[in-house]
Every structure is written in structure tokens, then in C-alpha cells.
């Protein structure tokens, strides 16, 4: 069921229901529970594209418009300092077999750039979103999703790949970021934390949400993911924050209720097709957008990130199920599978709505808003 929509001037306001978020193109590794320190990539330029390592009947466009509850930034918890134990390290790990690069996760050796040079690129993801500094771009139109309402049959593959839970999507799910910017959905995945520890990848003014869904898409200009890696706009990810609400989210429950079946790393099950768009916020018109990368090796750049302003509500029990059911490699719980936020290095985050106006708890002094660059290109 849908929850009311957020108010106009409240970035990242109240949640709608959304569907499950299986794994996305980044295969997310499991996270250690030990404290770790932020380790942003170096400032060196991204290797050339040739050096980048390796990561269909259209139903009507789903209208998105009911009123939603508001969550204002002043209600958010205080910012976590870099180096907070919740921040995973931008590193791969040495696996239990002693192999240097075969299995990686957040924290440990070797550093991700050794696994994939692109991880040291200048335009990496995730990032911290500061609505006050976002460039309002009226040319950013509401997203269009076509064919996302799947019938129960044929069933879809839901898999615990040791890094996340991934739902593989069939052909036919089309998404448009705007005219001529058309994509096909590939898969869904989730990032989460642990008990009492949030695990979203992106943050908002330093606030980390309980979890985050990524729906990964391939540009129609490319036939395969491998072709699109590192190419500007070759891949696009729709991201939404998941947070706690009073009611069970029926869309997500269709996936969460099956997690026990895939508790073991590498296990999979078949789930009935569902309305994938119900896993996302209902407001497709208000979002932040920037160019970044995959959030795990190969960390390929050129990925267009669209982060919904509206959040998705799950019950406390559902969030607990998400973070406390799956197991990763080496008999460790699959938890805290998120990468530390990366420096913008001059990138401008664009907003499809005037996010910087009357929306911040620090609006007392004038703020210089960025202007929209090349929106709609």
C-alpha cells in the first residue's frame, strides 16, 4: 500500500512503499563488524576507459502523486564523523584462503585500487548529498518506468551472492531518465547495516539511513554490461533510502519473507514476479542526480546515479529481517555492506526540484545555489 507523499520543500521526506531491492550491478561484499577508518580514493585521474576493469510491450507510465508525510532535515540525527566505526573502509579484504584479490570486502587488504584501478578514480560513489548545494535543474523531468509491474509467472531468481541479496530482472523493464536517455533494468540489490547501525550507501548531510535499494540499469545504447562499463551514461542506478515506519511494507515483504531460504552464501530461490516499481518511492519527480561509479570493484565510472528525495518505509521487523538473516563468506553475517562516501572532487549534484530553498535547518544565512549544468543532456 502507498503511504502519503512528502511535502514539496522537504528533501528526503516521508516514505512510500517500495518493492524489494535485490542486488544491483555492484556485487556487494559482506562487511566486517570491526571498527574501520574512512579511506577515500586518491586524487589521481581515473584510468582511461580501456583500462577499466570488469562489475521490452510497454505498459503505461505509472503516475506518482499522492501527498506524503514530511521528514525535515532538522529531524535527522547528527552527522557521523569520518572514521566513525560505522564507516566501512574503501578497501578489499584478504579472504580466508589467504588469496590477495580473489574475494574482497569492505575493510582489510588489499586496497580496492589494487583489485581494480578504477576504484582510485576521482568520480566515485557513493557520495554525501547536501541539498543546500544541489543545483536545481528544471530540465530534469519525472522518471518514466515502463513494464515494471511483473506478473507472478514466470518467477524471478533471488540470490544471496555473499555480498548482498540480488533479484535478477527479466527483459522488458524500461526506464527513461529523460528524452533519449533510455535504459533497461537488469537487477535489484540492497545495502544495509546491522542492529542499531544504519547501512545506506549514500548519506544526506552526513546522515546514514537504515538501508538503500539500488535498481541497476543498462543504457539501450549497449547490448551488454561489459560494453557499458566506464562509458559515460552506460549504466544508471536508481537509489532510494529505506527507513523505519509503523507499518509492514507489503511489497518488500514478498522478498524479505524468502530470505531465510537463502540464508547461506551462494544459495538462491525463485520468487513470484511482483510490481518492481512498488519497491521504490511513489514520487518520481523529485530526485538528486550525479555521475559516479559502481560502489564496489570494478568501481567503473560513468554511472548515472538518481537518488530519490522520497524515502521508502519498512517496519522495524522488516529492517531487522534484512540485516539479520543472511550469511556471507567465512561464516560471517552479511551485514554493513556499504562503501564509505567518496569525495565529490568538483562534481555538482543536480536536483529536479529546488532542494536548496527553505529546506535546511541552517537556512538563516544566504546560500549560494549552484546553477544547473547541462541538465537533460
Amino acid at each position: 500500500q502507498r503511504l502519503p507523499r512528502m511535502q514539496e520543500d522537504s528533501p528526503l521526506g516521508g516514505g512510500s512503499s517500495g518493492e524489494d531491492d535485490p542486488l544491483g550491478e555492484e556485487d556487494l561484499p559482506s562487511e566486517e563488524d570491526s571498527p574501520r577508518e574512512e579511506d577515500p580514493p586518491g586524487e589521481e585521474d581515473l584510468p582511461g576507459e580501456e583500462d577499466l576493469p570488469g562489475e521490452e510491450d510497454l505498459p503505461e507510465v505509472k503516475p506518482k502523486s499522492e501527498e506524503e508525510g514530511s521528514l525535515k532535515l532538522e529531524d535527522l540525527p547528527t552527522v557521523e564523523a569520518p572514521g566513525d566505526p560505522q564507516e566501512p573502509q574503501n578497501n578489499a579484504h584478504r579472504d580466508k584462503e589467504g588469496d590477495d584479490q580473489s574475494h574482497w570486502r569492505y575493510g582489510g587488504d588489499p586496497p580496492w585500487p589494487r583489485v581494480s584501478p578504477a576504484c582510485a578514480g576521482r568520480f566515485q560513489s557513493p557520495v554525501d548529498i547536501r541539498p543546500q548545494l544541489a543545483a536545481f535543474c528544471p530540465a530534469l523531468r519525472p522518471l518514466e518506468l515502463l513494464g515494471f509491474q511483473l506478473p507472478p509467472l514466470p518467477e524471478l531468481r533471488l540470490r544471496n551472492n555473499g555480498h548482498s541479496v540480488q533479484l535478477t530482472l527479466p527483459p522488458g523493464l524500461e526506464m527513461a531518465l529523460g528524452p533519449g536517455r533510455e535504459y533497461r533494468a537488469l537487477q535489484l540489490h540492497l545495502h544495509w547495516g546491522a542492529a542499531g547501525r544504519p547501512g545506506s550507501e549514500h548519506t544526506v548531510e552526513g546522515h546514514r539511513f537504515p538501508a538503500e535499494i539500488h535498481v541497476v540499469h543498462l543504457s539501450t545504447a549497449f547490448a551488454r554490461v561489459d560494453e557499458a562499463l566506464g562509458r559515460p551514461g552506460g549504466l544508471a542506478v536508481l537509489a532510494a533510502f529505506l527507513e523505519e515506519g509503523p507499518e509492514e511494507n507489503s511489497a518488500y515483504e514478498q522478498l524479505l519473507s524468502r530470505l531465510e531460504e537463502i540464508a547461506e552464501e551462494g544459495s538462491e530461490t525463485q520468487v513470484p514476479g511482483l510490481d518492481i516499481s512498488a519497491l521504490l518511492p511513489s514520487d518520481f519527480s523529485r530526485y538528486f542526480q550525479y555521475e559516479g561509479s559502481l560502489t564496489t570493484p570494478p568501481c567503473a565510472q560513468g554511472v548515472i546515479w538518481t537518488v530519490f528525495n522520497q524515502t521508502v518505509m519498512l517496519s522495524a521487523k522488516q529492517l531487522h529481517t534484512l540485516s539479520d538473516t543472511l550469511w556471507g563468506p567465512g561464516d560471517s553475517r552479511l551485514q554493513l555492506n556499504f562503501r564509505a562516501t567518496q569525495p565529490l572532487n568538483g562534481r555538482v549534484i543536480e536536483a529536479s526540484f529546488p532542494a536548496g530553498v527553505d529546506s535546511s535547518p541552517r537556512a538563516a544565512e544566504p546560500v549560494q545555489l549552484n546553477s544547473c549544468l547541462a541538465a537533460g543532456d
Epitope: 556485487d27 580501456e50 583500462d51 577499466l52 576493469p53 570488469g54 562489475e55 521490452e56 580473489s102 574475494h103 574482497w104 514466470p154 535478477t168 527479466p170 527483459p171 522488458g172 533497461r184 537488469l186 543498462l218 547490448a223 551488454r224 554490461v225 561489459d226 560494453e227 562499463l229 566506464g230 570494478p298 567503473a300
Partner: antibody
Framework: EVKLEESGGGLVQPGRSMKLSCVAS????????MDWVRQSPEKGLEWVAE??????????HYAESVKGRFTISRDDSKSSVYLQMNNLRAEDTGIYYC????????????WGQGTTLTVSS | QIVLTQSPAVMSAFPGEKVTMTCSAS?????MHWYQQKAGSSPRLLIY???NLSSGVPARCSGSGSGTSYSLTISRMEAEDAATYYC?????????FGGGTKLEIK
């Protein structure tokens, strides 16, 4: 359980034609690209042809060595894929595998048991 | 087309021994995939997208690499691992395979 079963191989003279068939089961056939890959002692594993989905207008691609001679086709209602081979040459000899390629991903996740084609006079 | 060169062509290992084989591409590829083929059988997908294990593949197998250099490692050799292993790329058409590494058990 995913199954791919090839048929149609055998002994054929150079210059003649042969048609291979592959019947699939255990998955939604129309959701997957289908490919033929062959194997010979001389050339090892060699990709031959690919056919995509109805939504891709059943687009096809071929290896340079078979272009103009081989034609790949599919019948989603029968969960079958075919390889029509004309003007066969001795170098076409090998085991022909029917493979499934998940759309948009660059690998072959299931293979049939293979059918042997021998081109010899 | 992108040429994949596997080395060594043949190798042998004792049970429990660690085994590593490599695959070098003539130009950079985004992902490398690995297949196992036992005598008299068809190839089986072992690792996809460089490092992801296919369903049913034991955790002692792992893959890594980037750019033009990739490797497949078996942490502890077992008798059932005796087979020929092939790497494969599909960065561009045509998809190509390596010549294979035959792994024998001592």
C-alpha cells in the same frame, strides 16, 4: 532444472547443408539470448552465432568464419533454437553446443551436451 | 578480436595444494568468465563477472583480476578439480575463449 538438448549432427560432405536443433526446458526460453558455440581440437572453443529476443527483433550475430553460410533462428513457442548450416567446410567439423546467455550479460550459463558434426568427403 | 592467452597450458597439483592459472587478454576487458570442462562432458560455468561463483561451485574456487590480467585460483586441490579450464570475454564481438589450462592431479 535447466536443460538444453541438441540434435541434428552427423557426417556430411563438404558443400552440403545441415540443420542443428536445440530444445530447451526448465526456464522461460523467451527471456534469454541463445548462442551456438563449437569445439574442435584445432580451434578449441569458438563462438558461432547468437540470437536475441523478440523485443530485440530477434537480432542475430555471427562469427566471421560462418557469416553468410550459417543462419540462427528461434521459435519461442517451441522453446527451440536452430542453426542452419550451408556450404559446409571441413573446418566446420566439431562438437556444437547450444548455450543460454542471460540477456545483457557476457557469459554462457548453461550448455547442452553437444552434437557432433563431421564434414568430410 | 580480443585474443585470450591462458597459462600454463598444462599443470598438475597434489591434493590440498593451491593452484593458480592465468588468462591474459590482448586488450582490456571489463569482466572475465571461467568454465570447467571435464573429459567427455560439456563446459560448465564456474565463475562469472571475474569473481562471482556460479551456483554449486565450491568456495575453494575464486577468480580475480582486472584490465588485461585475470586469474583463477583453487585454494585446495581435490580430485574432482581435475579438468580443463577456459577463460572467456565478451567486451566486444566476437566473444572469445582462451586455449585452456589442463589441470591434472598428481
Amino acid at each position: 532444472e535447466v536443460k538444453l538438448e541438441e540434435s541434428g549432427g552427423g557426417l556430411v560432405q563438404p558443400g552440403r547443408s545441415m540443420k542443428l536443433s536445440c530444445v530447451a526446458s526448465g526456464f522461460t526460453f523467451s527471456y534469454y539470448w541463445m548462442d551456438w558455440v563449437r569445439q574442435s581440437p584445432e580451434k578449441g572453443l569458438e563462438w558461432v552465432a547468437e540470437i536475441r529476443l523478440k523485443s530485440d527483433n530477434y537480432a542475430t550475430h555471427y562469427a566471421e568464419s560462418v557469416k553468410g553460410r550459417f543462419t540462427i533462428s528461434r521459435d519461442d513457442s517451441k522453446s527451440s533454437v536452430y542453426l542452419q548450416m550451408n556450404n559446409l567446410r571441413a573446418e566446420d567439423t566439431g562438437i556444437y553446443y547450444c548455450t543460454r546467455a542471460p540477456h545483457y550479460y557476457g557469459y554462457f550459463d548453461y550448455w547442452g551436451q553437444g552434437t557432433t558434426l563431421t564434414v568430410s568427403s | 578480436q580480443i585474443v585470450l592467452t591462458q597459462s600454463p597450458a598444462v599443470m598438475s597439483a597434489f591434493p590440498g595444494e593451491k593452484v593458480t592459472m592465468t588468462c591474459s587478454a590482448s586488450s582490456s576487458v571489463g569482466y572475465m568468465h571461467w568454465y570447467q570442462q571435464k573429459a567427455g562432458s560439456s563446459p560448465r560455468l564456474l565463475i562469472y563477472d571475474t569473481s562471482n561463483l556460479s551456483s554449486g561451485v565450491p568456495a575453494r574456487c575464486s577468480g580475480s583480476g582486472s584490465g588485461t590480467s585475470y586469474s583463477l585460483t583453487i585454494s585446495r586441490m581435490e580430485a574432482e578439480d581435475a579438468a580443463t579450464y577456459y577463460c572467456q570475454q565478451w567486451r566486444s564481438y566476437p566473444p572469445t575463449f582462451g586455449g585452456g589450462t589442463k589441470l591434472e592431479i598428481k
